[in-house]
């Protein structure tokens, strides 16, 4: 059937529309388009003869129409008057006529709307505001947006006048928002610019800060007042009812007891005409003396001396408080307080006891803190550390060794090579070393205050060629699914490549295997019994490559759930019962048996001769691995028939 489709159906003024013909019959002579729902010669727009391909304009032709050979009609530069029905009249070769009607609607492109308001400065809880979306346009839909969201549901919001007017009853400060209106018709949608509603409110009851009401003589009093208000409030201060100043802040330096009293802040909003006040009572106390700490030993020696710290001055009926590292005193058998808490004794001081220490005197109002005191604990030297940690160096390089030992006062250092004193410095430097520089390098650290000294010896080999490596491990007996193991390839040498093999193969890719420290360290996370393999490390440099002897990882595991054999559970009276228990475990587990919950023997095999129905019951095998600290068990029911 012949049909007409309008593309688009809703057309904007100035745009174009295509009346698209569907199911056009075969063997046509020609066709004509008419304005309206019927064929009317006075309202013919255009005719078209197929044989001549000739288009002939009709009385309703405006010059904006184009007819296509497929009978479709394009109308350009659409005007409002073009709205309506269009009829296509098709003349077949057999002169039989066929008609079809289509239609479209024309709408104007909407202008950008604007918002008018009946009240630019409404007062909170008093006024209403009506916003109107301009201009008024026919066939347009009106929408409203608040802070770019659609209108909330509220009994105080009302739409009227075909949604063109939005009324806010009894405005509140929360109605201070961005309002937009939108006009829509089938061909366009436009939003207005934002209108910000300026709601006048307040002042609310003012807040005076800070909140504390107690001060010490000699302090500065600095009070600030704030009240929520639009426009911002004007502030006034009164002390004991007497006006002081019209400022938001009140500042009185170096206060005395005479400044005690009631302090009132008044907030005023000139637009709403409202006033609100808040009163705070300030108390000024006389100043107690500042405490200080005395010590009976200013340079105590670690692990030898005790130190008594005393809080001065001594004042009757006073509470003394102590702090270490800005924290209250930790519980420790090495810390003792005297009965009145005035003296803090540190027994057998350590380097971690340096502090700082503070004491405090508590009065009605606050706690007065002393200045911090730091203890100068003499300690060390600890065993010195020689860095870097390399033990092998190639000939021709510079040897630069540094020694460090924790010590207070800082240690004095000496270097010896093969027992011969070299120099009294923290660093030892030898340029362009040869094999002759191989030997025992000793760093000696001395603490002049404590008189103690400690040494560390390091064997250094100068050789282009590396030795056969060895593997060190941080855990010789790791527990399955619990421990990690770090293997390290020794020695540590410069310009050296480190390689690893497991059971003669290169390392498998596994998230549980990790190489670090320049591939010198191989870490196995969360070991399993399958990791009990032979590990070999290799070292390589320009003139040598060598492999370590294998190290086999001894993984402790189990005990797994035990198995009782034989599996039989039914026996004849008079038979021998011979139960064997086995559990996978490293090391081998300890076995024990219980019959009907009663402990029996600590053996792997349970033997009972000539059983009777009295031997019916539950037989439990318990296994425990002392190395892993894990236990397991299994229960088997035995039935003896007469």
């Amino acid at each position: 059937k012949l049909t007409i489709e309008s593309t688009p159906f809703n057309v904007a003024e100035g745009k174009e529309v295509l009346l698209l013909v569907h199911n056009l019959p075969q063997h046509l002579f020609g066709y004509s388009w008419y304005k309206g729902e019927r064929v009317d010669g006075n309202r013919q727009i255009i005719g078209y003869v197929i044989g001549t391909q000739q288009a002939t304009p009709g009385p309703a032709y405006s010059g904006r129409e184009i007819i296509y050979p497929n009978a479709s009609l394009l109308i350009q530069n659409i005007i409002q008057n073009d709205t309506g029905f269009y009829t296509l009249h098709v003349i077949k070769s057999d002169l039989v006529n066929e008609e079809a009607t289509g239609q479209f609607r024309v709408y104007p492109e909407l202008p950008k709307p604007s918002i008018s308001s009946n009240n630019s400065k409404p007062v909170e809880d008093k006024d209403a505001v009506a916003f109107t979306c301009e201009p008024e346009t026919q066939d347009a839909t009106y929408l409203w947006w608040v802070n770019n969201q659609s209108l909330p549901v509220s009994p105080r919001l009302q739409l009227s006048n075909g949604n063109r007017t939005l009324t806010l009853f009894n405005v509140t400060r929360n109605d201070t928002a961005s309002y937009k209106c939108e006009t829509q018709n089938p061909v366009s949608a436009r939003r207005s610019d934002s209108v910000i509603l300026n709601v006048l409110y307040g002042p609310d009851a003012p807040t005076i800060s800070p909140l504390n009401t107690s001060y010490r003589s000699g302090e500065n009093l600095n009070l600030s007042c704030h009240a929520a208000s639009n426009p911002p409030a004007q502030y006034s201060w009164f002390v004991n009812g007497t006006f002081q100043q019209s400022t938001q802040e009140l500042f009185i330096p170096n206060i005395t007891v005479n400044n005690s009293g009631s302090y009132t802040c008044q907030a005023h909003n000139s637009d709403t005409g409202l006033n609100r006040t808040t009163v705070t009572t300030i108390t000024v106390y006389a100043e107690p003396p500042k405490p200080f700490i005395t010590s009976n030993n200013s340079n105590p020696v670690e692990d030898e001396d005790a130190v008594a710290l005393t809080c001065e001055p001594e004042i009757q009926n006073t509470t003394y408080l102590w702090w270490v590292n800005n924290q209250s005193l930790p519980v420790s058998p090495r810390l003792q307080l005297s009965n009145d808490n005035r003296t803090l004794t540190l027994l057998s001081v350590t380097r971690n006891d340096v502090g700082p220490y503070e004491c405090g005197i508590q009065n009605e109002l606050s706690v007065d803190h002393s200045d911090p005191v730091i203890l100068n604990v003499l300690y060390g030297p600890d065993d010195p550390t020689i860095s870097p940690s390399y033990t092998y160096y190639r000939p021709g390089v510079n040897l630069s060794l540094s020694c460090h030992a924790a010590s207070n006062p800082p240690a004095q250092y000496s270097w010896l090579i093969d027992g011969n004193i070299q120099q009294h410095t923290q660093e030892l430097f030898i340029s362009n070393i040869t094999e002759k520089n191989s030997g025992l390098y000793t760093c000696q650290a001395n603490n002049s205050a404590s008189g103690h000294s400690r040494t560390t010896v390091k064997t250094i080999t100068v050789s282009a060629e590396l030795p056969k490596p060895s593997i060190s491990s941080n855990n010789s007996k790791p527990v399955e699914d619990k421990d990690a193991v770090a293997f390290t390839c020794e020695p540590e040498a410069q310009n050296t490549t480190y390689l690893w093999w497991v059971n003669g193969q290169s390392l498998p890719v596994s998230p549980r295997l990790q190489l670090s420290n320049g591939n010198r360290t191989l870490t196995l996370f969360n070991v399993t019994r399958n990791d009990a393999r032979a590990y070999v490390c290799g070292i390589q440099n320009s003139v040598s490559a060598n492999r370590s002897d294998p190290v086999t990882l001894d993984v402790l595991y189990g005990p797994d759930t035990p198995i009782i054999s034989p599996p039989d559970s039914s026996y004849l009276s008079g038979a021998n019962l011979n139960l064997s228990c086995h559990s996978a475990s490293n090391p081998s587990p300890q076995y024990s048996w219980r019959i009907n919950g009663i402990p029996q023997q600590h053996t792997q095999v349970l033997f009972i001769a000539k059983i009777t129905p009295n031997n019916n019951g539950t037989y439990a095998c318990f296994v425990s691995n002392l190395a892993t600290g894990r236990n397991n068990s299994i229960v088997k029911s035995i039935t003896v028939s007469a």
Partner: antibody, heavy 120, light 106 residues
Framework: QVQLQQSGAELVRPGTSVKLSCTAS????????MHWVRQGPGQGLEWIGW????????EYAPKFQGKATFTTDTSSNTAYLQLSSLTSEDTAVYYC?????????????WGQGTTVTVSS | QNVLTQSPAIVSASPGEKVTITCSAS?????MHWFQQKPGTSPKLVIY???NLASGVPARFSGSGSGTSYSLTISRMEAEDAATYYC?????????FGGGTKLELK
Amino acid sequence: QVQLQQSGAELVRPGTSVKLSCTASGFNIKDSYMHWVRQGPGQGLEWIGWIDPENGDTEYAPKFQGKATFTTDTSSNTAYLQLSSLTSEDTAVYYCNEGTPTGPYYFDYWGQGTTVTVSS
Amino acid sequence: QNVLTQSPAIVSASPGEKVTITCSASSSVSYMHWFQQKPGTSPKLVIYSTSNLASGVPARFSGSGSGTSYSLTISRMEAEDAATYYCQQRSSYPLTFGGGTKLELK
């Protein structure tokens, strides 16, 4: 199967230069170091030096500093030895040798040698 | 440089006879390595790191020593052992070889 294949014999004039090659198969030369050794007619072995093909680092015996230059082409798995300002003293068989990191020792793989004759 | 001196320069041995070649270093070394070379062929490693037998080398070969004095021993001479033997140090640069010991079959 690890192999080192060296280029053929060279007859060169005094004062000129020559470039010898050593192509490895069965391993990647970047995984180790390539050493060069020479042996004069009826004489002992002399170490010339080594190159690290991965980064181009080199070490030369003082005697061969300025005389020998090592290079590599890792794409063709080949090491080169260039000898300059040749004299009759440089007449010798030149060997490349190498130890793979999977093996437990070095100098375990040798090329067949390239004979260089310096003569006018 | 570290000079390696081999002795004797030439040695003759009958099949089944024990042969010892020594290598003396002018400076102490960590390890000594030994090579065998037959006429017209490339050198072949026989002992590495003083006392380790290289792959495919008969057990009649052994090495020992420390510091500046090292030796290579063939417990029972065989015809195929006739060759020139070189010691090598890799402890210091330049790497050096001994002058060689020629082992002949008597």
